[in-house]
């Protein structure tokens, strides 16, 4: 049903659903801070620009009854719940923050006639991809994919003389909700990816990663998987890898490797990670003092949502337009705003461009370098390291299909 | 429209040092590899080295390790090479280049000549 | 370091002639790439990944080969070709360049 929304008069109001589900297991109040930074510095933005008006956020929390797993299995009701208790209590704003769950996101979209932004820190999947009045401020699987797939074809490098076509995905079912979504897109067998590549298998238990590390028959010298160096060392342990085994490990919100004192464990020699280029300002802000890497980006995302909503408030009031119109709702892309740290850009679907960065460990420094970067805006390849100190023969990486001649 | 103006010709005696310096403009710096070559007379192009202005990622070419040094200052959008122990086989003609891959060596400075002369 | 050598080293043709440039490799490449330099200016960028034409370069001109040869192609040679043509590969590094082949009026 049509809910009014508390947006006009110089009045404008956020609604953050607060659910018990959430992409990263962040407590809520870190979330509340991080929303209460982000509408000071709106305040102070609208107040500069002449706009005499008031932004507030209300907090919407699940009662937590029935949705209490704490992760995203149980989230796809739990955001129509939320979204019937503001409807009861009249309590709409001009937009939805959250939630940061795939399933839940897919949802609510599904089953609301949705006449305003939604702004989400997740709903990485790609069933939430192409949605008009949805905006994802982390880095969704389709982004992923674009890299790895422009990557897996690339052979004008002096350092990737060979197009990859084919790959193994490890995929154990324990995964985070990002790398969960990440590499379901990457199983999908109608995915982009899938379409692109010859051949493609994964491996669901620990025995049949371990195995392929020196298969002589394995079909693919390229291993893809998602979480952190621990995660990798828990599975590969100090087992012998074939020499010409690529291991990419998917590693997005994470930025310990950017900290001068890391030292990459000898178990990475053979991983690349791919990562999110690290925020110059975050590590001393207020808002994320106290949070680790990966929360960080989760937090920033929903501190970024309130800057976005200031941003489009801003520019709707001052062409003297309505608020609570479709054309508002569908508003919230292909622009750039100015993000908590730095300019923040969105695609013509709502979802924000980064630049990825595929690292590498130098034999002789032990140490995470970067090889090349990758803006997801123009999709382009920018080579950093032409000379990298690999592991690998000749300081190339292999080919993906052990004895095949050169390409 | 994108620009790389080098610092002028210089004349060096055997063993002194000398600094080229390579401003760009208009594209942003720190999104493209600087490269450097050299072109002595009569002699083919020879590649030196590659700078990487935002992580400060430098390559050289094993021939040149010894005698270039690359350096940048991002904020004055300017590449650098410094080239000691200078001897009379060091005069050519050395140029910055851009690289926008997958065209490597997209623009290029107009060049510097140095000179090594007693 | 893969060794590149051009032929001819010296070529005299006239306007309107149809000209091939020949670049081999010391081993094999994916790609080459290609460089124009006339007399008191710097290179400039003219041909990359083998067949791609840089910015602003006429349609006359045209690269093509695989593996250890490569040729760069003018159909009809114009007097604003004449000049040295050099090629180049990064497929290992270092970079390296050929010789060059100087394009002369006849």
């Known amino acids: 049903s049509q809910v009014s929304q508390n947006c006009h008069n110089g009045s404008y109001e956020i609604s953050v659903l607060m659910m018990g589900n959430s992409a990263f297991a962040e407590p809520l109040k870190n979330l509340e801070d991080a929303v209460n930074e982000g509408l000071e510095i709106v305040r102070g933005r609208l107040q500069n620009a002449g706009l005499n008006v008031t932004v507030n956020a209300t907090f919407m929390y699940s009662d937590g009854l029935i949705h209490n797993s704490g992760d995203c299995r149980s989230s796809t009701c739990e955001g129509l719940d939320l979204l019937r208790k503001i409807s009861n209590a009249q309590r709409m704003g001009c937009v939805l923050i959250g939630p940061s769950c795939t399933y839940s996101t897919f949802q609510m979209y599904l089953d609301t006639e949705l006449s305003y932004p939604m702004i989400s820190a997740g709903s990485f999947g790609l069933s939430c991809d192409y949605k008009e009045t949805l905006t994802r401020l982390m880095s969704p699987a389709r982004k992923l994919m674009y890299f790895l797939v422009n990557f897996w074809k690339t052979n004008d490098l002096p350092f990737k003389t060979y197009s990859w076509s084919t790959s193994y995905v490890y995929k154990n079912g324990t995964e985070t909700e990002d790398c969960f979504w990440y590499l379901n897109a990457l199983e999908a067998s109608v995915s982009y990816f899938s379409h692109e590549l010859g051949f493609k298998v994964v491996l669901r238990q620990d025995k049949e990663f371990q195995d392929i590390l020196m298969d002589h028959n394995r079909k693919s010298n390229v291993i893809i998987m998602c979480g952190g160096p621990e995660f990798l060392y828990k599975l590969k342990g100090d087992r012998a890898v074939a020499e010409d085994i690529v291991i990419i490990l998917v590693d997005l919100f994470n930025d310990q490797y950017f900290e001068d004192n890391v030292t990459a464990p000898d178990y990475m020699k053979n991983v690349l990670v791919l990562t999110l280029s690290p925020g110059n300002s975050l590590l001393n802000s207020s808002f994320s003092r106290n949070l680790s890497p990966t929360k960080r980006d989760f937090a920033l995302a929903y501190l970024n949502g309130i800057l976005l909503f200031g941003h489009m408030l801003k520019i709707f009031l001052e062409n003297g337009e309505n608020i609570t119109t479709p054309k508002f709702a569908h508003a919230f892309r292909n622009l750039t705003f100015e993000g908590y740290d730095g300019p923040v850009t969105l695609d013509d679907w709502g979802d924000v461009d980064s630049t990825m960065v595929l690292l590498y460990t130098s034999v002789d420094t032990k140490k995470y370098k970067v090889l090349l970067t990758y803006d997801t805006h123009v999709n382009k390849t920018y080579p950093v390291d032409m000379s990298p100190t690999f592991t690998w023969k000749n300081s190339k990486l292999p080919n993906d299909i052990t004895g095949r001649g050169p390409q | 429209e994108v620009q790389l103006v080098q610092s002028g010709a210089e004349v060096k005696k055997p063993g002194a040092s000398v600094k080229v310096s390579c401003k760009a403009s208009?594209?942003?710096?720190?999104?493209?590899?600087m490269n450097w070559v050299k072109q002595a007379p009569g002699q083919r192009l020879e590649w030196m080295g590659v700078m990487n202005p935002k992580f400060g990622t430098i390559n050289y070419n094993q021939k040149f390790k010894d005698k270039a040094t690359i350096t940048r200052d991002t904020s004055a959008s300017t590449a650098y090479m410094e080239l000691s122990s200078l001897r009379s086989e060091d005069t050519a003609v050395y140029y910055c280049?851009?690289?926008?891959?997958?065209?490597?060596?997209?623009?290029w400075g107009q060049g510097t000549t140095v000179t090594v002369s007693s | 370091d893969i060794q590149l050598t051009q032929s001819p080293s010296f070529l005299s043709a006239s306007p309107g002639d149809r000209v091939t440039i020949t670049c081999s490799a010391s081993s094999s490449v994916n790609y080459m790439y290609w460089y124009q330099q006339k007399p008191g200016s710097s290179p400039k960028s003219w041909i990359y990944?083998?067949?791609n034409l840089a910015s602003g370069v006429p349609s006359r001109f045209s690269g093509s080969g695989s593996g250890t040869e490569y040729t760069l192609t003018i159909s009809s040679l114009q007097p604003e070709d004449f000049a040295t043509y050099y090629c180049q590969q990064y497929h290992d590094y270092p970079p390296t360049f050929g010789g060059g082949t100087k394009v002369e009026i006849k």
């Open positions: 280049a851009r690289d926008d891959y997958p065209n490597y060596f997209d623009y």
């Open positions: 990944r083998t067949s």
């Open positions: 208009g594209y942003t710096f720190t999104d493209h590899n």
